[in-house]
């Protein structure tokens, strides 16, 4: 589950460049744009994914701009700066020193401000609340065996411990997924809530991150759960910060 | 940290059975539970699994629906059997998967021996 | 995702290496334990993650492979490694019939 020595390419991470230049040749992957080694054992970081993205040329690009109906995560694409571990750094800023705070996930929880703006630390997202609705089934998809299912998938795919899928809700044709992670219960080695949330983002766009793996093939009983929109709402351990004039 | 399977035995073909696999040492929550059973000179056969946390199950294709798994308090997991034949008798184990997201098993009970036959 | 395990039985000399292979009908990346049993015991994990031993497990016992191919090599083979060998894949327990293979008794001479 490591970087596959036969062919050196990283399992978990289609955008990383990889050479057999480690520790006794053993294959090496480090992330497109940023050039940072990854651990092709686990998700690569939400962080060190958008920046791989945002540096692939254009032409090459084969994803799409998040829709416009999302409603927390509205900037859309940026270049952000990582941290040395592939983490956000609590304070983005673009080319042009407009600068804002952001949470563990990279979302913009303060009004952007500029150079002078301070972002004390980073805020922990530690509840993702995932809104799906399905297409149009002859009937409605049994719950316990939805939940199953996607409990399943988030351990074996993701490879997210089921004890931080807190519950899955179904009122057809909408299906929640709720992750939560507190600081306190995330180990070392534990993927985080906000790196599993994105690669489910992704497969469910059809833009699947995996080398190799094939795309999502999502079945409950059989039967196809096939997605036409995603909704995912960030809860952070302390709440954001957005003046009077945006709420309005 | 140990498991210990109880209730096998001796019971007529058609007959429901009730298993019970006892954890100490460890919170169960933290583990998916398995079930594997081994018929006399032959290979281990995995027939189910359940999440604690969210209480989801799964089993082998063969098992559904005649098998059942359930956490029935905070230190143990049953497995439940319903109608019984010849080739249900074995050894019957519980073990816990290692805590990680994959499925190996680091903690095994002795097994408990469920015979079938009239 | 069948495991198929090859030889049913192997024997060798003390001090002598033995070769079991595991394959699986699919990729299964890497997610596969070994595991030895006793007669009259449950099983016990040797290795995972295709080629990570186990808690103190000698290094006698080396695992290796990738994608749907694996093998477990015993080497300086001593009486008490006599036992069957297990593989399981560790990657899904959905849609399967089994997820160990049909295990090798390992015959110690």
């Known amino acids: 589950h490591t970087a596959a020595q036969d062919n050196c390419t990283c399992p978990t991470n289609k955008m990383t460049v990889c050479s057999p230049d480690g520790p006794g040749g053993r294959c090496q992957c480090r992330a497109l744009g940023s050039g940072m080694a990854v651990d092709c054992s686990t998700l690569t970081s939400k962080c060190l994914l958008l920046k791989a993205r945002m540096s692939a040329p254009k032409n090459a690009r084969t994803l799409v701009r998040p829709s416009e109906h999302a409603l927390v995560d509205n900037d859309g694409l940026y270049d952000p700066d990582c941290d040395p571990e592939g983490r956000f750094k609590a304070r983005q800023c673009n080319q042009t020193s407009v600068c804002w705070c952001v949470n563990s996930v990279g979302v913009r929880r303060t009004d952007k401000g500029d150079l002078s703006l301070r972002c004390d630390e980073l805020v922990r997202t530690h509840h993702i609340l995932i809104d799906l609705r399905h297409r149009p089934t002859a009937g409605a998809f049994n719950h316990s065996d939805l939940d199953a299912e996607l409990r399943r998938l988030f351990r074996e795919r993701y490879r997210l411990h089921p004890k931080f899928v807190a519950a899955v809700h179904y009122e057809q044709p909408t299906i929640q997924i709720e992750l939560r992670q507190n600081t306190s219960q995330k180990a070392a080695g534990d993927v985080d809530i906000g790196d599993a949330a994105y690669y489910f983002e992704r497969d469910i766009k059809g833009e699947s991150l995996f080398q190799g793996r094939g795309g999502l093939d999502l079945r409950v009983r059989g039967e196809p759960l096939q997605v036409e929109r995603t909704l995912i709402y960030y809860l952070d351990e302390i709440p954001p910060k957005f003046s009077m004039k945006r709420l309005t | 940290q140990s498991l210990e399977e109880s209730g096998g035995d001796l019971v007529q073909p058609g007959a429901s059975l009730t298993l019970t696999c006892k954890a100490s040492?460890?919170?169960?929550?933290?583990?998916?539970m398995l079930w594997v059973r081994q018929a006399p000179g032959k290979g281990l056969e995995w027939i189910g699994c359940?999440?604690?946390?969210?209480?989801?199950t799964y089993f082998a294709s063969w098992a559904t629906g005649r098998f059942a798994i359930s956490k029935t308090s905070s230190t143990t997991v049953t497995l439940q059997m319903t109608s019984l034949t010849a080739a249900d008798t074995a050894t019957y184990f519980c073990?816990?998967?290692?805590?990680?997201?994959?499925?190996?098993?680091?903690?095994w009970g002795p097994g408990t021996l469920v015979t079938v036959s009239s | 995702y069948d495991m198929t395990q090859t030889p049913a039985s192997v024997s060798a000399a003390v001090g002598g290496t033995v070769t079991i292979k595991c394959q699986a009908s699919?990729?299964?990346?890497?997610?596969l334990a070994w595991y030895q049993q006793k007669p009259g015991q449950p099983p016990k994990l040797l290795i995972y993650d295709a080629s990570d031993l186990a808690s103190g497990v000698p290094s006698r016992f080396k695992g290796s492979g990738s994608g749907t191919e694996y093998t477990l090599t015993i080497s300086d083979l001593e009486c008490d490694d006599a036992a069957t060998y297990y593989c399981q894949q560790a990657y899904t327990i959905g849609n399967i019939d089994n997820a160990f293979g049909g295990g090798t008794e390992v015959v110690v001479k």
């Open positions: 040492g460890f919170d169960l929550n933290n583990y998916a």
């Open positions: 699919e990729d299964i990346y890497s997610l």
């Open positions: 073990a816990r998967d290692d805590g990680t997201t994959s499925y190996y098993l680091n903690l």
């Open positions: 359940i999440y604690i946390s969210g209480g989801t």
